[in-house]
């Protein structure tokens, strides 16, 4: 009989008797060696196993796959491509699993998947055709609807000759297959700038994470046609201020909540508009919370309590006035 | 697919409390919003108001604000309604409905308003 | 608060007709103009957002357009399950507003 799990406790398969079948083809609703599976739960957990590649005799029932805390270097193309098709993935999760490559078409054949976590790591090769599959310029959709790449930057020695940000932005946009993405987390991967046309290629996001990142402003960024965003994660960045028109684009946003703690405000004119717009908007979670990092004689005081006496830019003296 | 799923009809006298629910599952693909729109017997739909789930954070429509309260309960994925003071012209079906754009909607809950 | 006026109330078309339903709104709305179906005892559901984006799982059949203040909804070839009410909704200025529904009967 199958090792497949009963109604509702998962099933670990022996690697003995793995191995003992190896030679034979694989049994239909069979659980990999090291792996724990539930059918009544469609889920298959593989996880701090050390696997170093995807299991080739992962369940057709499949619709939960765990392959967490693993050494698999490289997803190539096909990497879930079986015969018959994992109809049923829905969600895949790969984080921690010290790759370094996705090849293009890693994710192809399957068509149910709606949500993927590629988070934690570190990703200094990911093809620009990873989540569209080809290199036509108009891709057949995705099926994703959350694609999870929090902490995915390699450590500096190991980053290829290209912006980190680049290389991301190109496997987001490929083939425009990602138009139905409603939720794209990128918390924690040292972006310096967002590229200004990453978000309007992407109109159904809902929720967007950029989270602990080093954004210094979002002076060129769009999020107008971001009709429907409802979370925009902006914490723990390096803004400085938010300009009128990002503070006009947000506000014409009728469903979005905005998070923007720990940044480094900068308190002189220039935060003036978003002082008053602070005072008038809703859309701030926590706007109470905001307080200014700079100029020193301003350290800690909260935004909401500033008036336009308190912000001033000390005056640019001509050049003949200037001291050495 | 989002599945709302919403506490059952309910009769109550004037001046009373009524406090409906709604349950959420297939919870990975939900909105933060969760709307509450009124129907009377008869007529059109009427937005009474909102909460983003997350945070707590409300929107009311004027005309039910202070009589309405939209509260969520982020660990059991339900959000909550309570009208106060019931009047004959609250009797209705309530409606919860997922999502900025309302994507989703409960089957609603008949609330009867009777002395 | 802006107020949706959806016209006609009531109409009858038979089986493959183009039907179209008007929704205008007081002020300027932008494209935030959702269309809503609901038949009888059965949940609420939205078929169109954004004045012209499908929901998923919508049949093709189902359309809008417009922009501002003038919207239309339109189904290229009546369906038998289509009998319904349907309404007009705006997101763009809190407190949303509905129009007053168009009850959609077969010939």
């Known amino acids: 009989s199958s090792p497949t799990s009963s109604a509702s406790s998962f099933s670990s398969s022996a690697p003995f008797l793995a191995s003992a079948v190896s030679a034979q083809p694989p049994l239909p609703d069979q659980c990999p060696a090291l792996c724990e599976c539930s059918e009544a739960a469609r889920t298959v957990k593989c996880v701090n196993r050390n696997l170093t590649e995807v299991p080739t005799d992962l369940p057709a029932y499949v619709r939960n796959l765990f392959l967490t805390g693993n050494q698999l270097a490289v997803l190539p193309a096909g990497a879930f491509a079986r015969r018959p098709p994992l109809a049923e993935l829905a969600a895949l999760n790969l984080s921690g699993s010290r790759l370094d490559e996705v090849r293009a078409g890693a994710f192809e054949h399957l068509p149910s998947l709606r949500q993927l976590d590629l988070s934690h790591n570190p990703l200094a090769d990911l093809s620009p055709f990873a989540f569209s599959g080809s290199n036509a310029s108009v891709s057949a959709p995705s099926p994703l609807v959350e694609l999870i790449l929090n902490h995915i930057v390699p450590p500096e020695d190991e980053r290829q000759n290209r912006s980190f940000e680049g290389m991301v932005v190109a496997a987001l946009l490929a083939g425009r297959a990602l138009q139905g993405l409603r939720r794209l987390e990128l918390a924690s991967n040292h972006f310096l700038y967002l590229p200004r046309d990453v978000l309007a290629q992407l109109p159904s996001l809902r929720h967007l994470d950029l989270s602990n990142n080093s954004l210094v402003s979002l002076t060129y960024v769009s999020f107008r046609n971001l009709t429907h965003l409802e979370s925009l994660h902006l914490e723990d960045n390096a803004l400085k201020v938010l300009h009128n028109g990002t503070l006009a684009e947000l506000q014409g946003l009728p469903h979005i909540r905005v998070f923007l703690d720990n940044n480094p405000w900068v308190c002189d004119c220039h935060m003036a508009d978003m002082v008053t717009w602070l005072k008038e908007t809703e859309v701030v979670q926590g706007k109470d919370r905001l307080t200014c990092a700079y100029p020193e004689k301003m350290r800690n005081r909260v935004l909401l309590e500033l008036n336009s006496a308190d912000l001033d830019c000390d005056p640019i003296l001509p050049p003949s006035l200037q001291t050495s | 697919e989002v599945q709302l799923v919403q506490s059952g009809a309910e009769v109550k006298k004037p001046g009373a409390t009524v406090k409906i629910s709604c349950k959420v599952s297939?919870?990975?693909?939900?909105?933060?919003?969760m709307n509450w729109v009124k129907q009377a017997p008869g007529k059109g739909l009427e937005w009474i108001g909102r909460i983003y789930r997350e945070d707590g954070h409300t929107n009311y429509n004027g005309k039910f604000k202070g009589r309405a309260t939209i509260t969520a309960d982020t660990s059991t994925t339900t959000a909550y309604m309570e009208l106060s003071s019931l009047r004959s012209e609250d009797t209705a079906v309530y409606f919860c409905?997922?999502?900025?754009?309302?994507?989703?909607w409960g089957q609603g809950t008949l609330v009867t308003v009777s002395s | 608060d802006i107020q949706m006026t959806q016209s006609p109330s009531s109409l009858s078309a038979s089986v493959g007709d183009r039907v179209t339903i008007s929704c205008r709104a007081s002020q300027d709305i932008s494209n935030y103009l959702n269309w809503y179906q609901q038949k009888p005892g059965k949940a609420v559901k939205l078929l169109i957002y954004y004045t012209s984006r499908l929901h998923s799982g919508v049949p093709s059949r189902f359309s809008g357009s417009g922009s501002g203040t003038d919207f239309t909804f339109t189904i290229s070839s009546l369906q038998p399950e289509d009998i319904a009410t349907y309404f007009c909704?705006?997101?763009?200025?809190?407190?949303?507003?509905f129009g007053g529904g168009t009850k959609l009967e077969i010939k």
């Open positions: 909704q705006q997101d763009n200025t809190l407190p949303w507003t």
């Open positions: 409905a997922n999502g900025g754009a309302m994507d989703y």
């Open positions: 297939g919870y990975a693909f939900s909105s933060s919003w």
